[in-house]
């Protein structure tokens, strides 16, 4: 099919365009080009007869068109009016006509744009600035660049007027940047020169440096003032309210105690009309001052607060030293020193961090020590302890219970019996108790500073007669040659005799057996498998004698070195090999076999039928006790003869 391709499709003014013909039919008589989408004699540009190779201009010919034998049309020196459709009319030798239409667009070459601004010196946090990209051009796209980056997303940035205008609302000093605009159309793109936005701001609150406020007599005082400001601030110094000089730096040589006072720096911005001042109090010491410690938290709470201890005063070119408990600082991740060593920070204080803390200032002759400071760390209450620990009392005695919970400030105590409040004291005293005084005794400890409370409940039984005792153990499955086991006979009672039996016999004499806690606790050190026996405790008082149920100690041991049976190591070819492995172990071990180092099966018995000399080699039994975490093995050589 006959088609027209425009090369290029978008044409810049003054350039040329080629209307290239594709699929031109053969056996042509001639062809004509027309301006527009149809054949119109009034709008004929040029005609061409192939036989004569004669080109004939039409009414729409401008003199800038050239027709080629292949029917393509070149138009030079393109003008805006050339935009539009072009129709090729082909007359074939059989006088049958064929038409095709093509088109192109003409765009002007864009000029270099420029930026105009409605405010050349906007004031921070007050003014808005509108940048406009000039000139205004039809069919052009406008783009903006800030510091050669595309525009950031910000509610303070707004594009309008077809993106030709960029408005910055409530300018800030951070808007001081290079702004460029760019115009684009299909045939060109031009970028403006950059415009630097000059935002007026400040002055901010001035900073006086150095920060130290303590000086020795005879030193030079050299204070510098700086305030962020545009244009740069003008500075004035005042001492004790009296104007000194309009400079950024204040220098006073060889100061004396009389130079102590308040030093004010005033920063002024003539464009914004704003003033800001900062005051520092300078102290001049006749002698090196005795240091002292200030704390940012006088009553820190344990495990919650950090405390920063600062050694005062701040003196230039001084070495600061610290001591805790009259020792140099221990290495601890919870202790941090500032770069100048003047501030010691305790992270997440504990009750052990009370101190005392001392700091020192080192001078040429000596080290001046501060007075010690003790931290008042608030903690607790911990779980209260009720003493004595007896749970059984005989009727007629006096019951005197004392409660204590570690706490700072000291805890306030309350006693409850069977949930009923009794008294707000640390000690509870009941004289001449009876069985009616049996019950649940609760001590409640309260820390008024932290607001925390903790309680401990103790069951008190008043009975002349003791109950059947029971044995508690601190280790239900001890490991042989490793663990110790402590058996305790419960309950704990006053005026009670505790006795022990092993397998129905009184305790054997052994350095590994130890009685403690009034014979109430029996400890077995370094248990062995032979300690796996029945342990019974007995209690006796004035009216009763009772035995506990036996507790059998389950000692974990092994695996011992395994034994492979039968012991034979020589076999005849064709026999069955049936090896059994056994190792003393509690609990029973896991078994596995290896032949010549190659893993076989996880069974206690290894069976191979009709062995041959190929079965010669080393047979290893491996045993493993998961409870003790121990392993063992044995290797046996097997020879099979033909």
């Amino acid at each position: 099919k006959l088609t027209i391709e425009s090369t290029p499709f978008n044409v810049a003014e003054g350039k040329e365009v080629l209307l290239l013909v594709h699929n031109l039919p053969q056996h042509l008589f001639g062809y004509s080009w027309y301006k527009g989408e149809r054949v119109d004699g009034n709008r004929q540009i040029i005609g061409y007869v192939i036989g004569t190779q004669q080109a004939t201009p039409g009414p729409a010919y401008s003199g800038r068109e050239i027709i080629y034998p292949n029917a393509s049309l070149l138009i030079q020196n393109i003008i805006q009016n050339d935009t539009g459709f072009y129709t090729l009319h082909v007359i074939k030798s059989d006088l049958v006509n064929e038409e095709a239409t093509g088109q192109f667009r003409v765009y002007p070459e864009l000029p270099k744009p420029s930026i105009s601004s409605n405010n050349s010196k906007p004031v921070e946090d007050k003014d808005a600035v509108a940048f406009t990209c000039e000139p205004e051009t039809q069919d052009a796209t406008y783009l903006w660049w800030v510091n050669n980056q595309s525009l950031p997303v910000s509610p303070r940035l707004q594009l309008s007027n077809g993106n030709r205008t960029l408005t910055l609302f409530n300018v800030t000093r951070n808007d001081t940047a290079s702004y460029k605009c760019e115009t684009q159309n299909p045939v060109s793109a031009r970028r403006s020169d950059s415009v630097i936005l000059n935002v007026l701001y400040g002055p901010d609150a001035p900073t006086i440096s150095p920060l130290n406020t303590s000086y020795r007599s005879g030193e030079n005082l050299n204070l510098s003032c700086h305030a962020a400001s545009n244009p740069p601030a003008q500075y004035s110094w005042f001492v004790n309210g009296t104007f000194q000089q309009s400079t950024q730096e204040l220098f006073i040589p060889n100061i004396t105690v009389n130079n102590s006072g308040s030093y004010t720096c005033q920063a002024h911005n003539s464009d914004t009309g704003l003033n800001r001042t900062t005051v520092t109090t300078i102290t001049v010491y006749a002698e090196p001052p005795k240091p002292f410690i200030t704390s940012n938290n006088s009553n820190p709470v344990e495990d919650e607060d950090a405390v920063a201890l600062t050694c005062e005063p701040e003196i230039q070119n001084t070495t600061y030293l610290w001591w805790v408990n009259n020792q140099s600082l221990p290495v601890s991740p919870r202790l941090q020193l500032s770069n100048d060593n003047r501030t010691l920070t305790l992270l997440s204080v504990t009750r052990n961090d009370v101190g005392p803390y001392e700091c020192g200032i080192q001078n040429e002759l000596s080290v001046d020590h501060s007075d010690p400071v003790i931290l008042n760390v608030l903690y607790g209450p911990d779980d209260p302890t009720i003493s004595p620990s007896y749970t059984y009392y005989r009727p007629g005695v006096n019951l005197s219970l004392s409660c204590h919970a570690a706490s700072n400030p000291p805890a306030q105590y309350s006693w409850l019996i069977d949930g009923n409040i009794q008294q707000h004291t640390q000690e509870l005293f009941i004289s001449n108790i009876t069985e009616k005084n049996s019950g649940l005794y609760t001590c409640q400890a309260n820390n008024s500073a932290s607001g925390h409370s903790r309680t401990t409940v103790k069951t008190i039984t008043v009975s002349a007669e003791l109950p059947k005792p029971s044995i508690s153990s601190n280790n239900s499955k001890p490991v042989e040659d490793k663990d110790a086991v402590a058996f305790t006979c419960e309950p704990e009672a006053q005026n009670t005799t505790y006795l022990w039996w092993v397998n129905g016999q009184s305790l054997p004499v052994s350095p590994r057996l130890q009685l403690s806690n009034g014979n109430r606790t029996l400890t077995l050190f370094n248990v062995t498998r032979n300690d796996a026996r029945a342990y019974v405790c007995g209690i006796q008082n004035s009216v009763s004698a009772n035995r506990s149920d036996p507790v059998t100690l389950d000692v974990l041991y092994g695996p011992d070195t395994p034994i492979i049976s039968p012991p034979d190591s020589s076999y005849l070819s064709g026999a069955n090999l049936n090896l059994s492995c056994h190792s003393a172990s509690n609990p029973s071990p896991q078994y596995s076999w290896r032949i010549n180092g190659i893993p076989q099966q996880h069974t206690q018995v290894l069976f191979i039928a009709k062995i041959t000399p190929n079965n010669n080699g080393t047979y290893a039994c491996f045993v493993s006790n998961l409870a003790t975490g121990r392993n063992n093995s044995i290797v046996k050589s097997i020879t099979v003869s033909a």
Partner: antibody, heavy 120, light 106 residues
Framework: EVQLQQSGAELVRSGASVKLSCTAS????????MHWVKQRPEQGLEWIAW????????EYAPKFRGKATLTADSSSNTAYLHLSSLTSEDTAVYYC?????????????WGQGTSVAVSS | DIELTQSPAIMSASPGEKVTITCSAS?????MHWFQQKPGTSPKLWIY???NLASGVPARFSGSGSGTSYSLTISRMEAEDAATYYC?????????FGAGTKLELK
Amino acid sequence: EVQLQQSGAELVRSGASVKLSCTASGFNIKDNYMHWVKQRPEQGLEWIAWIDPENGDTEYAPKFRGKATLTADSSSNTAYLHLSSLTSEDTAVYYCHVLIYAGYLAMDYWGQGTSVAVSS
Amino acid sequence: DIELTQSPAIMSASPGEKVTITCSASSSVTYMHWFQQKPGTSPKLWIYSTSNLASGVPARFSGSGSGTSYSLTISRMEAEDAATYYCQQRSTYPLTFGAGTKLELK
């Protein structure tokens, strides 16, 4: 072998006092509590008191406070019951007994009893 | 004081017969203990801590109960069992005995 040997029968006048003894063998009285029990003729048993010979601690039934006094002498392994201001109501057999562990078993050992007769 | 009431006060039983003696306490006690006494002899601890037989006591004897109600049972009466049986509480002072149950052979 554990034994409690009590002193012989007593015939005493009304208003007088008497001191009964109980001597232990086969164990140390310091290691155990000694109880005393009264049994009137054709009557039941009444608990009087116990003593801890190691420290002299005692516990009396209210009825016998002022009437009975318990003491012990560790050197002779003997416990004593002193009865004062005797009346016909005090005519009875008085037993000492002890609850001890003999080996693995808790055993209750009794003396043979001492008969006290109060005459007017 | 905790009062112990034994019943019956006196009873007779034929050989082989089952015998039950009860002891009721005026307040709850931890355990009950039983003593056997034959004429002219000292009492013997027979059952301790409610249900444990003292050394040498035949297995036909048993004890049970809790709180305020306890009992001594002989599964099959024998001639040597004829005696007076006393219950005793040791939970609170003063320690008290029941008045006794006299068991005779029928």
